[in-house]
Amino acid sequence: VLSPCESQPCQHGGQCRPSPGPGGGLTFTCHCAQPFWGPRCERVARSCRELQCPVGVPCQQTPRGPRCACPPGLSGPSCRSFPGSPPGASNASCAAAPCLHGGSCRPAPLAPFFRCACAQGWTGPRCEAPAAAPEVSEEPRCPRAACQAKRGDQRCDRECNSPGCGWDGGDCSLSVGDPWRQCEALQCWRLFNNSRCDPACSSPACLYDNFDCHAGGRERTCNPVYEKYCADHFADGRCDQGCNTEECGWDGLDCASEVPALLARGVLVLTVLLPPEELLRSSADFLQRLSAILRTSLRFRLDAHGQAMVFPYHRPSPGSEPRARRELAPEVIGSVVMLEIDNRLCLQSPENDHCFPDAQSAADYLGALSAVERLDFPYPLRDVRGEPLEPPEPSHHHHHH
């Protein structure tokens, strides 16, 4: 009997393995070399959303595309080989410390030449997956004493970027204290970044499991061919059907002039480290990219005079500075941006169960993306929050928050 792999169906160096097919026959499964994916490894991943890193291994967006950030001692596109090992080798033994989350490693005679004995609460070949929800009802306390001093210094210290450490006191989560605080299912923060549907985490409170349970999950990014075009033509008054998708930001509602607005509750407030005039010059691109990330429509909130509510954000002045120095005009280092969320098309789409009902839930989602290093947004965000009521008077925003 010919092996289903005889015809070498896997492209781009993917490994073919026979597997049981329907009706008892044999078919094949391709194990793709990154960044390729698809049934025959025929597609190239253009974003982390499309790249299948081994469970527990984070994906990083690099200038050359998405890459799996292998743990120390492992390398290769799928983090299965030693640095310097021949291509295709999968001989990661205990020397490479392959067991994650405190698991202990034992050598084994067969590939991959190791076996992990996992610590409590973890499972999988490399202890990469959380076991059934542990008995403990809360995340462990912050294990590193040094993290206390680093909280709130506006730098994301990776070693403190965990729920127990409050995501480095919010420094890694855009100042959102705990993006998953409303989520009753424990461990959802761990599963948020795994590109797999985890039904227990797919509720609004658990931030929709990063849309992993949404139809077509891995293909839900704006087609790179359209991306620049859609940003240029966002909210330009003409309907571009190629951009009129949730993953491309609904074309700035250009195709929805007859559909009544459906605003989410509250105002989404972002501090962006670009001065207002610079931000407003690229406002269509800014709003299109953010709308695409949130899969709904964003626009500037207008003040009573019909002007976009984009206010200067000044460099915080240390309290110890001499009074005369403080009275000089403070340096504008960014913008405080107030946005409305219009769910008219999100709620009209066939699966309308993934819209953000209020600004705070959208802020939590952005904070979560930032915490797991998956916020693919070219504008430097300092913090994000939802304001439930009327925002304060503009003058308030001319000072440090």
Epitope: A235, G237, Q307
Partner: antibody, heavy 119, light 107 residues
Framework: QVQLVESGGGLVKPGGSLRLSCAAS????????MHWVRQAPGKGLEWVGR??????????DYAAPVKGRFTISRDDSKNTLYLQMNSLKTEDTAVYYC??????????WGQGTLVTVSS | DIQMTQSPSSLSASVGDRVTITCRAS??????LNWYQQKPGKAPKLLIY???NLQSGVPSRFSGSGSGTDFTLTISSLQPEDFATYYC?????????FGQGTKVEIK
Amino acid sequence: QVQLVESGGGLVKPGGSLRLSCAASGFTFSTYVMHWVRQAPGKGLEWVGRIRSNTYGGITDYAAPVKGRFTISRDDSKNTLYLQMNSLKTEDTAVYYCARAEARYRDVWGQGTLVTVSS
Amino acid sequence: DIQMTQSPSSLSASVGDRVTITCRASQSISSHLNWYQQKPGKAPKLLIYAASNLQSGVPSRFSGSGSGTDFTLTISSLQPEDFATYYCQQDYHTPFTFGQGTKVEIK
């Protein structure tokens, strides 16, 4: 009904300035992208520029011959579109039209106002 | 900038004739093309948007076709009120540009 009415045209010397207005009525002006188009006497149509709504930052785009000299702005509280024209040249002589951009096309035009640049 | 070239620049036709005007873009503009009719002393009037969509209120004798770089406006049976100048216009990318116009005159 939906209407656009331009005003402010007239005779101006080369190097001078002029501000055209376009008063809108019959629709929610603030939500629309608005355009200026001009037509020199006996010639074809030429796109001048556009402005997005303020909810999307009021971004402006211009045709190369007017970039740096003309400025499009809007006052949503007055339902009015403006075209500020500085450093005018004789080749800017034209009828200037304002137009509303609908979701799929530019569907409403004003009647036009004539600007003559001559010494 | 995207150049739009119309042909012919003028034509003479009789009532009842089938008239075809073509428009060529210097690069692909997908279906982002509009056709306008303008009569002397009046503002342009939109006939066709997005290459082939008839604007509401426009008689069905007007039709548009094409995509990419080559487009056509057809008047199936010319009527007296159709004698005017016709312009194509791309709104694929700013600066939006018009063709130089085609004047349809009575033979």
